[in-house]
Structures are given as C-alpha cells and as structure tokens.
C-alpha cells in the first residue's frame, strides 16, 4: 500500500522538515527559515510562532516543530499552547476557573500558585493554637496545655466564635 501510495503521490515521500514543492516538480524542499513541517507529505511549511511581548520562548522553532512559548515571570500560561498569559495570584488566593479567588475561611496559600490548603488542626496532635491562621499563613501550633509550665491551667478555654483569622479547633 505504501508503495502504491508513493507511486500515486510523490509528496508522501517528503519527510517532516520538508515540503513538496510544486514549483520544482514536486521535489522535497527544506522548510524555509522560520517555518516548519511536523509531519511528512506536507505541501507547505507552517510559519513558526513568535513569542513576543508577555510571551517568551520556551523552545525554539525547528524545521520539524513549532516554537513553544511561556509567560514572563509574574504570569502563567492559559490555553492550548500558551495562547494567553494570566497574572499569578497573590498569596492568600487560589486560581479557579474564573480567575484568582481569596482563600475561604480556614484555608491558606502562602504561594502565588497552587490551591488553598486547610489550616493545620493543632488539636489533632494534642497541641494548641499559638498563632492564628490567615489566608496567607497556616496556624502555628504551640505546646499542648499539659506541656505548659507547672501551675498553668490544663483546661483549654472554650473556642471563641468563628472569626476570620482563627483556626477551627
């Protein structure tokens, strides 16, 4: 079948990185500069993508593959092949389908990427909250009440009403 196909269509013999040049008796010609063909048998080469402005080159164009872009620092890619750049979220936010959203109460994100994670539950380790959590920071767990200096109350006071910045016990 391949032999029959190549007899019928000489262009099928042209490998990636070349095109079947109708102007030169269907000879396989190399793709011109700044163009590529990623598959064999193509009658034209595609123009290489140029990574400009907020887009920067992640991978240079070659005769057989297109250039690949990513975004300049402070931005990240959106879409197939990085067609758009979106500003990184701030600490205390996470990226959702609708963009950057503040972390919900009881969660935090200390990075500009990734998702909001639940505050550490200090009581699971028998510890108490030393520093309250925020949208940007996890709670800091302190020693358990029993570890406190002699004479200190070993009774944990009742948890206050839930307010922003307080870890649920």
């Amino acid at each position: 079948f391949e032999r029959t196909r190549s007899l019928q269509d000489p262009c099928s013999n042209c490998p990636a990185g070349t095109f079947c040049d109708n102007n030169r008796n269907q000879i396989c010609s190399p793709c011109p500069p700044n163009s590529f063909s990623s598959a064999g048998g193509q009658r034209t080469c595609d123009i290489c993508r140029q990574c400009k402005g907020v887009f920067r080159t992640r991978k240079e164009c070659s005769s057989t593959s297109n250039a690949e872009c990513d975004c300049t620092p402070g931005f990240h890619c959106l879409g197939a092949g990085c067609s758009m750049c979106e500003q990184d979220c701030k600490q205390g936010q996470e990226l959702t389908k609708k963009g950057c959203k503040d972390c919900c109460f009881g969660t935090f994100n200390d990075q500009k990427r990734g998702i909001c994670r639940p505050w550490t539950n200090c009581s699971l380790d028998g510890k108490s909250v030393l520093v309250n959590g925020t949208k940007e920071r996890d709670v800091v767990c302190g020693p358990s009440p029993a570890d406190l200096s002699p004479g200190a109350s070993s009774v944990t006071p009742p948890a206050p009403a839930r307010e922003p910045g307080h870890s649920p016990q």
Epitope: Q50, K52, F75, A80, S83
Partner: antibody, heavy 116, light 107 residues
Framework: QVQLVQSGAEVKKPGASVKVSCKAS????????MHWVRQAPGQGLEWMGA????????DYNQKFKDRVTMTRDTSISTAYMELSRLRSDDTAVYYC?????????WGQGTLVTVSS | DIQMTQSPSSLSASVGDRVTITCRAS??????LNWYQQKPGGAVKLLIY???RLHSGVPSRFSGSGSGTDYTLTISSLQPEDFATYFC?????????FGGGTKVEIR
C-alpha cells in the same frame, strides 16, 4: 496603576497623515505588545495591528498594511500609530490596548476626523 | 480571517433581568474568546478572558461559557450600570477579530 493615555483629537484633510500616541505607565512598557484598534462612528471594533516594544517588530492587518506604521519610543514608554493617505472613512476613534492574549487595559481613545 | 458573529445586535431589558449574548466563530477558536464592555462615553473595558475567566474588579453577575465555535456571555441580574455595548473577540489567530457588538438598552 496600569494606564494608557492617548493624545488628543485630530482633524485632518483627505490625503494627509495622522500620528496618534499612547503613553504607558504603571508597568514595564517593553514587556507587553501594544495593539491598535479603531471604531468608526456607530460601528464595531476593528483590529489594526500590533507592535512589540522590545524589538519594534510589527504585525499589521492586511487591510491597513500599506498605510499604517506602528513605532515606539521605549525611553518615554510611548507607542505610536501613524495612518497615511487618510480618507473620510478613516474617521474613527483609535484605541491602543495592552496585550496578554486579551486586551486587559485600553487607552481612552483618540478621535480622528477626516474632512475636507 | 476568523469571522465572529454576535447576536442579538441589540436587546431591551429591565433591571434584574437575566441577559444572554452569544458569539459564534467561523472556526474552532479553542476557548480563546474574550468579552469587552463599552459604555456610551467610549471607554472599553475587559470583562471576561479565555471564555470564562472574570477580569479583576468585574462583578460576579457576569459569566462566560462555551467551547469550539459557540460562546456565551451572561449577566445574571442586569444592573443600571450594565446598559452598554458588549463585544466578543477571538485571540486564536491574527488578525484579531471582534463580533459586531450587542447594545443592551433599557426597556
């Protein structure tokens, strides 16, 4: 904050040229392509082209290719769009816009009136 | 060039109404679709990018959806400040092209 401030309204005669400026502030000018879009009275938005301030490289809409020139002066964070051989149907508001694959910030627009 | 067909070209609605505007591309634009609002004074603002992502500061009553060639902008409960003209725009290929616009007027 990020801002694009354009030059003032212009009145030109047919056959003349107009040069509209767009001054950027609040961000690194060279880091983002600047696009130009126009809107004729009562009409929709029409993309004219773009310039990469870092290199000066341009992409033009074929419709304007032989009449438009986009330039920039990085020292004053300003992009320019010059349209030559003006006709009455070039009467429009011309906008510059910063590009991230979408136009997140637009200039206030510059009205260019072409009239004899 | 990729043609963008927006409908309706105009609509009348009341405050509190749910409004839907559609945009159809002449070929698959792989979600590279943005929506803009233009107030009568001429100022243009980005509302939604990459089909559904809300630009910072845009109220959550605005939402976008779609894929392939068909896209939608929805205003869940129209407010007085939403009376304006809305444009879709594709970023899949140069030249960037816009829909013809939808003017949202007070009924």
């Amino acid at each position: 904050q990020v801002q694009l401030v354009q030059s003032g309204a212009e009145v030109k005669k047919p056959g003349a040229s107009v040069k509209v400026s767009c001054k950027a502030s609040g961000y690194t000018f060279a880091g983002f392509e600047m696009h130009w879009v126009r809107q004729a009275p009562g009409q929709g938005l029409e993309w004219m082209g773009a310039i990469d301030p870092k290199t000066g490289g341009t992409d033009y809409n074929q419709k304007f290719k032989d009449r438009v020139t986009m330039t920039r002066d990085t020292s004053i964070s300003t992009a320019y769009m010059e349209l030559s051989r003006l006709r009455s149907d070039d009467t429009a508001v011309y906008y510059c816009a910063r590009d991230l694959g979408y136009f997140d910030v637009w200039g206030q627009g510059t009205l260019v009136t072409v009239s004899s | 060039d990729i043609q963008m067909t927006q409908s309706p070209s105009s609509l009348s609605a009341s405050v509190g109404d749910r409004v839907t505007i559609t945009c159809r591309a002449s070929q698959d634009i792989r979600s590279n679709l943005n929506w803009y609002q233009q107030k009568p004074g001429g100022a243009v603002k980005l509302l939604i990018y990459y089909t559904s992502r809300l630009h910072s500061g845009v109220p959550s009553r605005f939402s976008g959806s779609g894929s392939g060639t068909d896209y939608t902008l929805t205003i869940s409960s129209l407010q007085p400040e939403d009376f304006a003209t809305y444009f879709c725009q594709q970023s899949e290929k140069l030249p960037r092209t816009f829909g013809g616009g939808t003017k949202v007027e007070i009924r």
